[in-house]
């Protein structure tokens, strides 16, 4: 049974030519995370294995950073990178946990972060 | 190129432990980032993924066989190990040791990439 | 554990035709799906990774393609040594799981 929940930062934005860390965190479950995939809008951004490391998707090497943890760092951000980001969890044994994120990236210095919020 | 080879007898009697050996060439286990996997076949079946471990000693099993397994690494040989206990005429298979994830960091996928050969158990008195 | 089912169990189609093979998740794999072949008293082989990328020396009448829980393996024109068992597998969620095998035959 999945009792887990998955913890995100929900609404957020950011400045055109700035960064943002994405995260997610999964609480109220033992279950073991063995990886992370990072997709945008079935785009994938970037994998995190447990065992076998980061994979950086090529065609966001140079956006896209690993970590901190197991979250994700988008660099010189676009007004195209504004959309919906999901954080896979992968674990055993429970199986698949998804949280999303949606990420507004403006063109003035007035981005604020939005608040949490959970996903089941 | 990685390759593998798995060793081990062809008979075994039931209620008894099944172990096989399999070893690795063309690369160190213990720098590879990589899952060593076991797979089995019974005779006209499909495949059945066993279980797997990670260099560091992390290990996967399938929960159906998850009370009877043991996968083991020995970095020093260049070789990992499966155990199965307790035998039955439905342990009979093709045994395949297996490389999974080997292009992980490159392109980002977790699959069997590089199979052994295989070798016949038959658990029979 | 995610349950794969592929379908049909055989298949039989004539050398130069186009083969297709289905395989379905019991929940979504997102595009983290793997198709092998095998041949009699062989190992599977890996032809295709990411529900749609080739592997490695895999000619390009292997085609793959589906997201989610549906996904199909196409063979656009069936050579004499494509006559073979082959599997879907998903992961990375542990317990990796198989499909049953669709056996393409000769018609």
């Known amino acids: 049974m999945m009792t887990g929940t998955i913890e995100t930062t929900g609404n957020i934005s950011a400045e055109k030519g700035g960064s943002i860390i994405l995260q997610c965190h999964l609480s109220s479950t033992t279950a073991q995370v063995t990886q992370v995939n990072w997709e945008q809008q079935d785009q994938l951004l970037a994998i995190c294995n447990a065992d076998l490391g980061w994979h950086i998707s090529p065609s966001f090497k140079d956006r896209v950073a690993p970590g901190p943890g197991l979250g994700l760092t988008l660099q010189s951000l676009t007004v195209n990178d504004t959309g919906e980001y999901f954080c896979i969890y992968h674990t055993y044994p429970d199986g698949t946990y998804t949280g999303r994120i949606f990420l507004e990236v403006l063109e003035s210095s007035v981005a604020e972060h939005g608040a949490r919020f959970q996903i089941p | 190129q990685l390759q593998l080879q798995e060793s081990g007898p062809g008979l075994v009697k039931p209620s008894e432990t099944l172990s096989l050996t399999c070893t690795v060439s063309g690369g160190s286990i213990s720098s590879g980032s990589y899952y060593l996997a076991w797979i089995r076949q019974p005779p006209g079946k499909g495949l059945e993924w066993i279980g797997s471990i990670f260099r560091s000693g992390s290990t996967y099993y399938n929960p159906s066989l998850e009370s009877r397994v043991t996968i083991s690494v020995d970095t020093s040989k260049n070789q990992f190990s499966l155990k199965l206990s307790s035998v039955t005429a439905a342990d009979t298979a093709v045994y395949y040791c297996?490389?999974?994830?080997?292009?992980?960091?490159?392109?980002?996928?977790?699959?069997?990439?590089?199979w052994g050969q295989g070798t016949t158990v038959t658990v029979s008195s | 554990e995610i349950v794969m089912t592929q379908s049909p169990a055989t298949l039989s189609v004539s050398p130069g035709e186009r083969a297709t093979l289905s395989c379905r998740a019991s929940q979504s794999v997102s595009s983290n799906l793997a198709w092998y072949q095998q041949k009699p008293g062989q190992a599977p082989r890996l032809l295709i990774y990411g529900a749609s990328t080739r592997a490695t020396g895999i000619p390009a009448r292997f085609s793959g393609s589906g997201s989610g829980t549906e996904f199909t393996l196409t063979i656009s024109s069936l050579q004499s040594e494509d006559f073979a068992v082959y599997y879907c597998q998903q992961s990375p969620p542990w317990p990796r799981t198989f499909g049953g095998g669709t056996k393409v035959e000769i018609k």
């Open positions: 297996a490389i999974e994830g080997a292009n992980f960091k490159d392109f980002g996928y977790v699959a069997f990439d590089i």
